[in-house]
């Protein structure tokens, strides 16, 4: 059951070594702090991953989606689950790993010329004029006047990065573009193999900050080159 997954609420991560308080998240990947598991004092790497409760896909990382871990899914706690690779079953785009999308219940590669049109069709069909739902989710970020809070702050609607405050860039978030934080050292970044392929992303990441470049993480050994994790690293 889900309770056993969460082990009676004992999602006990070690205190953050890199901030986390005062509105700053800790370093995303590079520090990979140990995680303290309930009932034991073992430090374990981030690969033995602790369940992360979520309400929506956007709360999860780029390689995850939000769902109930039990088949059939009770209406209780949902957690971030690993994204589905190509040819795996899916119910919505967010379930598929980056570079893939959900078509006819299967994750397929987005490296296809017709993909962009298809995504835009899906968005148009789902939202019509009232921007109500996508993939069964309740109201998403909209372009209404409500979104224009302090100009250029995180989450503000933008057209280009110059619209955003320092330390933020303008990146795609569903069908709109919003100001998101420029990536810091160790954070996951997107390395585009094909020119223009960033147009396919529903959740676009910012670029790496000054003095950093997006490179394959050295210790990230995976079978296929294409699925290797890229992080922002010092030049």
């Amino acid at each position: 059951t889900l309770n056993s997954v969460l082990n009676s609420n004992a999602i006990k991560n070690l205190p953050p070594p890199l901030g986390g308080a005062a509105g700053h998240p800790g370093s995303a990947v590079s520090a990979a702090p140990g995680i303290l598991y309930p009932g034991g004092n073992k430090y374990q790497t981030i690969d033995n991953y602790q369940p992360y409760p979520c309400a929506e896909d956007e709360e999860c990382g780029t390689d995850e989606y939000c769902a109930s871990p039990t088949r059939g899914g009770d209406a209780g706690v949902q957690i971030c689950l690993a994204c589905r690779k190509r040819r795996k079953r899916c119910m919505r785009h967010a379930m598929c790993c980056p570079g893939n999308y959900c078509k006819n219940g299967i994750c397929v590669s987005s490296d296809q010329n017709h993909f962009r049109g298809e995504i835009e069709e899906t968005i148009t069909e789902s939202f019509g004029n009232d921007h109500s739902t996508l993939d069964g989710y309740s109201r998403r970020t909209t372009l209404s006047s409500k979104m224009y809070h302090t100009k250029g702050q995180e989450g503000s609607v933008c057209l280009r990065s110059s619209d955003c405050a320092s330390g933020l860039c303008c990146a795609r978030h569903f069908w709109s573009k919003i100001c998101k934080p420029v990536l810091k050292e160790g954070q996951v970044c997107t390395k585009h193999r094909r020119k223009g392929s960033h147009g396919l992303e529903i959740f676009q990441r910012c670029y790496c900050g000054e003095g950093l470049s997006c490179r394959i993480q050295k210790d990230h050994h995976q079978a296929s080159n294409s699925s290797r994790l890229h992080t922002c690293q010092r030049h």
Epitope: N13, G23, Q50, R139
Partner: nanobody, 124 residues
């Protein structure tokens, strides 16, 4: 800059109640699910409760279910946690938090944006 400021903590006897508040600023509050997490002395972060953007759905850890109630006021950019029937094991620093989301490859409580926290002590 994302800012979350918690208040409402204090010393309370077992069985007592407290209401925590969290004032959010620096981001469009209404488009983010929010949560409360806590950290007991010498322990790691522990998830307590979650609420969707519109407040329509809530989730609770087993240890607080039926005793705690999470709510939000999007017009005021405020998040709340009503804590009833408090127990000594609820003693902790309580943080209001928001996910870092798609900036990381895998989400973790450590990567969340959160405030400085408010101390809740349950003791007779």
């Amino acid at each position: 800059e994302v800012q979350l400021v918690e208040s409402g903590g204090g010393l309370v006897e077992p069985g007592g109640s407290l209401r925590l508040s969290c004032a959010a600023s620096g981001f469009p509050f209404s488009i983010y699910p929010m949560k409360w997490v806590r950290q007991a002395p010498g322990k790691g972060l522990e998830w307590v409760s979650h609420i969707t953007r519109d407040g329509g759905r809530t989730m609770y850890a087993d240890s607080v279910k039926g005793r705690f109630t999470i709510s939000r006021d999007n017009a005021k950019n405020m998040l709340y946690l009503q804590m009833n029937s408090l127990k000594p094991e609820d003693t902790a620093v309580y943080f209001c938090a928001r996910s870092a989301g798609k900036v990381v490859s895998r989400a973790s409580l450590e990567n969340d944006y959160r405030g400085q926290g408010t101390q809740v002590t349950v003791s007779s």
